[in-house]
């Protein structure tokens, strides 16, 4: 828990350089995000494909979309879970991180020093050991997050099932209802290829309790979709006399010394002129 209050931002006096004053873990061990580069990667043949159970959410069900002042968050049902880790990890929410229209490079994880346009996090908690995400969040093996790197490209109808509701959650504290859809559609091709490491929440309180799975392949959203994400939301309440745009809501990469990131794939990805790999 924070030493005093829960005010934190991505910019200004309460920005990430100050997080550790109120949230000591933010200055501690196993911090995320990180840069994924070749000299820290090690292939691990035991990293088998994950199975995504209960990800196909019925449109007859309503799911709460919230502007929490830091991101836009979609609540997920507890019977949605990942199979293939040491315990069952049940879903709790998903949210995004992004940059701004002038610098649309707001992913949290980077690959060989390069940012992607944005990043999706699907947060799960260890439901074999803990009753809810809140309890699990500061416990060992408590959380597992799937991270999807997002690049600018073609229009993505699946992501639009979230983006089309942004106008109803423009300000902090606002909530809207989203029809269920297949969350697996938000994942990239070849989900069997991923990076795996032990890290932390990328937001305060930065608990070092996250098993990270970062998918190797990005998904695409259109320039218009990215712009909508970058311009639709505010960090402040509707009646705030000093509105603040919700932009650049990503943490800088953290030092990652004397540790390894494990990959489910062997690193070489050669493309010939014919497009074969």
């Amino acid at each position: 828990a924070p030493v005093n209050g829960s005010k934190w931002t991505y910019f200004g006096p309460d920005g990430e350089n100050s997080w550790s004053k109120k949230y000591p873990s933010c200055g501690g061990l196993l911090q995320s995000p990180i840069d994924l580069h070749s000299d820290i990667l090690q292939y691990d043949a035991s990293l088998t494909p994950l199975e995504f159970q209960g990800y196909n959410l019925s449109a007859n069900k309503q799911f709460l979309l919230t502007n929490n002042g830091h991101s836009v968050k979609l609540n997920l049902p507890s019977d949605m879970h990942i199979q293939g880790l040491q315990s069952r990890y049940s879903a709790t929410q998903l949210h995004l991180h992004w940059g701004n229209p002038n610098d649309p490079h707001g992913s949290e994880h980077t690959v060989s020093g390069q940012h992607f346009a944005a990043e999706l996090h699907i947060v799960h908690y260890n439901s074999d050991l803990y009753p809810d995400a809140s309890t699990a969040s500061n416990k060992s093996e408590g959380l597992a997050v799937l991270a999807v790197l997002i690049e600018m490209g073609s229009f993505n109808p699946s992501y639009d099932k979230i983006f089309s509701h942004l106008q109803h959650v423009k300000y902090k504290g606002q909530e809207a209802f989203v029809p269920g859809f297949n969350i697996e559609e938000l994942l990239p091709e070849r989900t069997a290829e991923y990076y795996r490491y032990r890290g932390s929440l990328t937001t305060p309180p930065c608990n070092p309790t996250v098993l990270w799975t970062v998918f190797r392949n990005p998904v695409q959203i259109s320039q218009e979709q990215l712009l909508a994400l970058e311009t639709a939301l505010y960090c402040t309440h509707m009646d705030d006399p000093s509105p603040r745009e919700m932009i650049n809501n990503f943490r800088q990469v953290q030092k990652f010394d004397e540790r390894l990131v494990y990959t489910s794939f062997s690193q070489v990805q050669v493309c010939t002129a014919a497009g074969l790999s």
Epitope: S58, K61, E175, A176
Partner: antibody, heavy 121, light 106 residues
């Protein structure tokens, strides 16, 4: 025939609590959320909260958070509304209802008959 | 919260009259739904997604509108139409209803 039937209403003392039931039949119970909506005498409709019978996940109108608890017994196809610290303003007909998706959002296609709760000493 | 204001709150009309009920939302909503309620009964779904009549609802009813202003219109009022009508939005949490418009016999 799809049906929702509420029960458990009656006279309750101020400060007391109520537990209402909503029994469903005629459809696959876990496929739809169950909502509780109330209507004070001569007044409009007010949403209390809902439950997903498949997993017990609940969402509440902020106004009732901490005072209302919705639960479910899947084996009985029945949802429950428990409300505590009742006051005179909680006097209302309480309905359960089921929303159906039509291609963009939902509307309440099935309603129970309602059960009257009167809070009075 | 999105406040829903219906007007008028009640109206008296005769059989055969054209009746218009308005619902104004305090913020923009995507769609509006309408329910009919008769005394001592549960509400019935009447119009969904602003303009679509629920199966069995007579074609003299219609709905229209967008953004913050929506209307329910009865082209030729019939005896069975005397009831209270409620609008409802589902765009934002909490979902909210209008206070109702009571259509009475003149």
């Amino acid at each position: 025939e799809v049906q929702l039937v509420e029960s458990g209403g009656g006279l309750v003392q101020p400060g007391g609590s109520l537990r209402l039931s909503c029994a469903a039949s005629g459809y696959s119970y876990t496929d739809y959320n169950i909502y509780w909506v109330r209507q004070a005498p001569g007044k409009g409709l007010e949403w209390v909260g809902y439950i997903d019978p498949a997993n017990g996940d609940t969402t509440y109108n902020q106004k009732f958070k901490g005072r209302a608890t919705i639960s479910v017994d899947k084996s009985k196809n029945t949802a429950y509304l428990q409300m505590n610290s009742l006051r005179a303003e909680d006097t209302a007909v309480y309905y359960c209802s089921r929303p159906i998706y039509y291609g963009a959002y939902w509307y309440f296609d099935v309603w129970g008959q309602g059960t009257l709760v009167t809070v009075s000493s | 919260d999105i406040q829903m204001t219906q007007s008028p709150s009640s109206l008296s009309a005769s059989v055969g009259d054209r009746v218009t009920i308005t619902c104004r939302a305090s913020s923009s909503v995507t769609y509006m739904h309408w329910y009919q309620q008769k005394p001592g009964k549960a509400p019935k779904p009447w119009i969904y997604a602003t303009s679509h009549l629920v199966s069995g609802v007579p074609s003299r009813f219609s709905g229209s509108g967008s953004g913050t202003d929506f209307t329910l219109t009865i082209s030729s009022l019939q005896p069975e139409d005397f009831a209270t009508y409620y609008c409802q939005q589902w765009s934002s949490n909490p979902l909210t209803f209008g206070q109702g418009t009571k259509v009475e016999i003149k």
